[in-house]
C-alpha cells in the first residue's frame, strides 16, 4: 500500500482476558467525521469490517464480533467485551469524510497463569548418573502470552549448564487460546542435594506490569551409596539394669542398606548377631548386666554386595549385685554387741547405708553397722542399702532380722473387755521373745496361734461368756526356754450407763449384738487399763 511505511505506530491497548477493551478512535475532526466511521479487524494482513457508525449510530457486522461490540463515549469509542486471546490483533477505525483516514490500535491481551504445579520425580535420582536426570516438572496452566519459567535451587536461579543442568520447556495451546507451559528440570545431583529445595517461578505480564508466581518447594529423593555406618545408643549417658535401651544402626546412604547388629562374644571372639525389630533396632528391655559388651553394625549394599562395618561401641549396663549381709540371721543376748557387714558388687563405686526397718532412720553410712549394749528393743529389722550415687535409682537392699534372747514379753499386762453374757467372745493375746514363745490359755475354748514374725506370736481364743468367766477373768501365758509371762483380761458386763455417748470406757465393746451363743466381732478393740508396772 503506497505510503504505508509512513504510518505512525499503532496505539497500544492492554487488557486482561475476559474484560472489556475500550478502542478509542483517535482520528481528529480534520481527519474524519466520527459520526461516520468504519471499524476493521486486521488478522494476518487481512482486513475485516466488523462495525459501522452512521450518524452516530453503531451497527455490528455479522461475524465473530457481532455480539461483543458497542459504542461508547458519544461514538468515539468502540467497546469489545469478553476479550479472548484471539482478539490480540490490530483494530482500525476509518473516517469517511472529508477524506478517508485511518487510526490503528494494537490490542494486547494478557492472562495470569494459574499457580504453577510442581511434581517431583518420585523415582529419585542416583548421584552418579552420567547425564542430567529429571528432577521435577513444572506446569503453568492457562496463561497468555506464554509465561517465562525460572527454576530455583535453594533460592538461587538455575542456569543451563552443559552436562549438569538442562531445562526443557514446551507449551500447548488450549481451545481457549490460552497457553499451558510445561518445563522439565534435568540435573546431575550430588549427595549434598539430598536436602536441596527446588521450585519453579512463572514470570508473566499484565496491564498493571510484570508479575510472578512461585510453586511450592520440593525435595527430590537423591540416591547415594552408604559410606559410613555407625551405632547410636538411647538413652545417652549412664545405663542401668532395668532401663529400656535401644541400639540403633545408622548409615549415611540412601536408601538405607540392610543392617545387622552383632555383639562380641569375649570367649569365642566371634560376633553373634542379635535379633532386631523391623526397623533394625535392637531393643534391650529390661537391660541386664549381661547385655554389656562390644556391639557393631554391619550394613550390606545389595546393589554391589559390598559390606560395611561400623566402629564397635562398648555398652555398659551398670548393675548392683544381690546384697549380702553377715551374719544373715543374728541372735544376741541382752547387753552384748553385734557387727553387721554388708557386701555387694557393682560396675561402679558403691555407697552403703544402714537403716532401721521400722522407722527408716539412717543408722550408719558405710558397709559396717556396730551395735553395742543390746536391749530387747534393739530386736527387729535392719536394712542395708547399696547404691550407686552417680546413677539415680540404681540400688539394691537386704533386710536382716536381729533376735535378742529373752523370756516372753507381753504386749499388755492387763486389759478390761466389755462383754454381754452368753456371747461368744474372741480374745487375743500377743507375746514376743527369743526363742519364739508359745501361748496357753487358762480357760477352755478354741485357740489358734499365728506368727507375726520369728520372735512374735499372736494367739486368739474363742470362748463363751459365762458367769464363772465373768468372775475369774481370762489369763494367757507365754513361755519359752528362758521363762514365762502372763496377761490378764478382765471381763465386765455392759450396762446402759456404760454406753453413754461421752463414755471413754466402751472401746472394748464388741460391735456384735449380744444374743445367746452369738459370736462377737473377732477383732473387737480393747481398751488397756493403766499399767504402772513394767510390761513383761
Amino acid at each position: 500500500v503506497p505510503g504505508e511505511a509512513e504510518q505512525p505506530a499503532p496505539e497500544l491497548v492492554e487488557v486482561e482476558v475476559g474484560s472489556t477493551a475500550l478502542l478509542k478512535c483517535g482520528l481528529s475532526q480534520s481527519q474524519g467525521n466520527l459520526s461516520h466511521v468504519d471499524w476493521f479487524s486486521v488478522h494476518k494482513e487481512k482486513r475485516t469490517l466488523i462495525f459501522r457508525v452512521r450518524q452516530g449510530q453503531g451497527q455490528s457486522e455479522p461475524g465473530e464480533y457481532e455480539q461483543r461490540l458497542s459504542l461508547q463515549d458519544r461514538g468515539a469509542t468502540l467497546a469489545l467485551t469478553q476479550v479472548t486471546p484471539q482478539d490480540e490483533r490490530i483494530f482500525l477505525c476509518q473516517g469517511k469524510r472529508p477524506r478517508s483516514q485511518e487510526y490503528r490500535i494494537q490490542l494486547r491481551v494478557y492472562k495470569a497463569p494459574e499457580e504453577p504445579n510442581i511434581q517431583v520425580n518420585p523415582l529419585g535420582i542416583p548421584v552418579n548418573s552420567k547425564e542430567p536426570e529429571e528432577v521435577a516438572t513444572c506446569v503453568g496452566r492457562n496463561g497468555y502470552p506464554i509465561p517465562q519459567v525460572i527454576w530455583y535451587k535453594n533460592g538461587r536461579p538455575l542456569k543451563e549448564e552443559k552436562n549438569r543442568v538442562h531445562i526443557q520447556s514446551s507449551q500447548t495451546v488450549e481451545s481457549s487460546g490460552l497457553y499451558t507451559l510445561q518445563s522439565i528440570l534435568k540435573a546431575q545431583l550430588v549427595k549434598e542435594d539430598k536436602d536441596a529445595q527446588f521450585y519453579c517461578e512463572l514470570n508473566y505480564r499484565l496491564p498493571s506490569g510484570n508479575h510472578m508466581k512461585e510453586s511450592r518447594e520440593v525435595t527430590v529423593p537423591v540416591f547415594y551409596p552408604t559410606e559410613k555406618v555407625w551405632l547410636e545408643v538411647e538413652p545417652v549417658g549412664m545405663l542401668k539394669e532395668g532401663d529400656r535401651v535401644e541400639i540403633r544402626c545408622l548409615a549415611d546412604g540412601n536408601p538405607p542398606p540392610h543392617f545387622s547388629i552383632s555383639k562380641g562374644n569375649p570367649s569365642t571372639r566371634e560376633a553373634e548377631e542379635e535379633t532386631t525389630n523391623d526397623n533394625g533396632v535392637l531393643v534391650l528391655e529390661p537391660a541386664r548386666k549381661e547385655h554389656s559388651g562390644r556391639y557393631e553394625c554391619q550394613a550390606w549394599n545389595l546393589d554391589t554386595m559390598i559390606s560395611l562395618l561400623s566402629e564397635p561401641q562398648e555398652l555398659l549396663v551398670n548393675y548392683v549385685s544381690d546384697v549380702r549381709v553377715s551374719p544373715a540371721a543374728p541372735e544376741r543376748q541382752e547387753g552384748s554387741s553385734l557387727t553387721l557387714t554388708c557386701e555387694a558388687e557393682s560396675s561402679q563405686d558403691l555407697e552403703f547405708q544402714w537403716l532401721r526397718e521400722e522407722t527408716d532412720q539412717v543408722l550408719e553410712r558405710g558397709p559396717v553397722l556396730q551395735l553395742h549394749d543390746l536391749k530387747r528393743e534393739a530386736g527387729g529389722g535392719y536394712r542395708c542399702v547399696a547404691s550407686v550415687p552417680s546413677i539415680p535409682g540404681l540400688n539394691r537392699t537386704q533386710l536382716v532380722k536381729l533376735a535378742i534372747f529373752g523370756p516372753p514379753w507381753m504386749a499388755f499386762k492387763e486389759r478390761k473387755v466389755w462383754v454381754k453374757e452368753n456371747m461368744v467372745l474372741n480374745l487375743s493375746c500377743e507375746a514376743s521373745g527369743h526363742p519364739r514363745p508359745t501361748i496357753s490359755w487358762n480357760v477352755n475354748g478354741t485357740a489358734s496361734e499365728g506368727d507375726q514374725d520369728p520372735q512374735r506370736v499372736l494367739s486368739t481364743l474363742n470362748v463363751l461368756v459365762t458367769p464363772e468367766l465373768l468372775e475369774t477373768g481370762v489369763e494367757c501365758t507365754a513361755s519359752n526356754d528362758l521363762g514365762k509371762n502372763t496377761s490378764i483380761l478382765f471381763l465386765e458386763l455392759v450396762n446402759l450407763t456404760t454406753l453413754t455417748p461421752d463414755s471413754n470406757t466402751t472401746t472394748g465393746l464388741s460391735t456384735s449384738t449380744a444374743s445367746p451363743h452369738t459370736r462377737a466381732n473377732s477383732t473387737s478393740t480393747e481398751r488397756k487399763l493403766p499399767e504402772p508396772e513394767s510390761r513383761g
Epitope: P126, K130, S262, D303, T304, M305, S307
Partner: antibody, heavy 120, light 112 residues
Framework: EVQLVESGGGLVQPGGSLRLSCAAS????????MSWVRQAPGKRLEWVAT????????YYPDSVKGRFTISRDNAKNSLYLQMNSLRAEDTAVYYC?????????????WGQGTMVTVSS | DIVMTQSPDSLAVSLGERATINCKSS????????????LAWYQQKPGQPPKLLIY???TRESGVPDRFTGSGSGTDFTLTISSLQAEDVAVYYC????????FGQGTKVEIK
C-alpha cells in the same frame, strides 16, 4: 564364554589423569556387578572400585576415594575407570573383574589386566 | 580396616605332598545368622590374572579340583592342597569381604 578386555593403560606423570576401559562380552553385562582390582609390582592385590549393575551405586577404598571414578555404559557393554591426581603408588596392573551370582562379594572373572605407570 | 595376614610367605612342597596355607583375620569374619564366613581364596599363576578358588571359606568354585579345600571359621582359615600338582605352582591370596574388601599379602607355593 565370559571375556573382559582392559585398555587405556600407559605412562603418565604424577598429578595426571588416565581413563581405563574394559570391554565385556559373553554375558549379559547389564546384569552384573563389576569391579576394578589392581596389583602393584610384587605387591598384594588391592580392590579399587565396584559399581552396581545399573550404575547407581559405586564404592571405593579410602586410598582412591575422590580421585578415581568407576562408571559403566550398559549399551556399550563397557566399564570405565577415570583416574585423576595420579600418584606413584597408583602404579600397578589394573584388572577388570565381574562378580558372580553368589550372596557374597567375589571376583569370579578377571581380565588380563592393563599396566599403569605413574612416573616423572 | 580388617587386616589379613597369611603364613607362610612362601612354601616349597614336593609333588604329591600336602600344602597348607594359613590366613588370619584381625577380626571375626563369621556372620552368625547365616553361619558363613566372608572369606575367599584366589590363585594367581605367573603372568596370569587371579582365579577364584573358594568362597564362604569352604565352598569350592565350580571347575576347581577337589584337592583344594578351604576350612576354618572366625579369624583363622586354611587352604589345603591335598596332593600338590605341577600346575598348582602359584601365589595364593585370601580375601575378606566382611568390611569392604582386603586381600592377604599372598603365599607363594613352589615345588621342592
Amino acid at each position: 564364554e565370559v571375556q573382559l578386555v582392559e585398555s587405556g593403560g600407559g605412562l603418565v606423570q604424577p598429578g595426571g589423569s588416565l581413563r581405563l576401559s574394559c570391554a565385556a562380552s559373553g554375558f549379559t553385562f547389564s546384569s552384573y556387578i563389576m569391579s576394578w582390582v589392581r596389583q602393584a609390582p610384587g605387591k598384594r592385590l588391592e580392590w579399587v572400585a565396584t559399581i552396581s549393575s545399573g550404575g547407581s551405586s559405586t564404592y571405593y577404598p579410602d586410598s582412591v576415594k575422590g580421585r578415581f571414578t568407576i562408571s559403566r555404559d550398559n549399551a556399550k557393554n563397557s566399564l570405565y575407570l577415570q583416574m585423576n591426581s595420579l600418584r606413584a603408588e597408583d602404579t600397578a596392573v589394573y584388572y577388570c573383574t565381574r562378580d558372580d551370582d553368589y550372596d557374597v562379594k567375589v571376583f569370579a572373572y578377571w581380565g588380563q589386566g592393563t599396566m599403569v605407570t605413574v612416573s616423572s | 580396616d580388617i587386616v589379613m595376614t597369611q603364613s607362610p610367605d612362601s612354601l616349597a612342597v614336593s609333588l604329591g605332598e600336602r600344602a597348607t596355607i594359613n590366613c588370619k583375620s584381625s577380626r571375626s569374619l563369621l556372620n552368625s545368622r547365616i553361619r558363613k564366613n566372608y572369606l575367599a581364596w584366589y590363585q594367581q599363576k605367573p603372568g596370569q590374572p587371579p582365579k577364584l578358588l573358594i568362597y564362604w571359606a569352604s565352598t569350592r568354585e565350580s571347575g576347581v579340583p577337589d584337592r583344594f579345600t578351604g576350612s576354618g571359621s572366625g579369624t583363622d582359615f586354611t587352604l589345603t592342597i591335598s596332593s600338590l600338582q605341577a600346575e598348582d605352582v602359584a601365589v595364593y591370596y585370601c580375601k575378606q569381604s566382611y568390611n569392604l574388601l582386603t586381600f592377604g599379602q599372598g603365599t607363594k607355593v613352589e615345588i621342592k
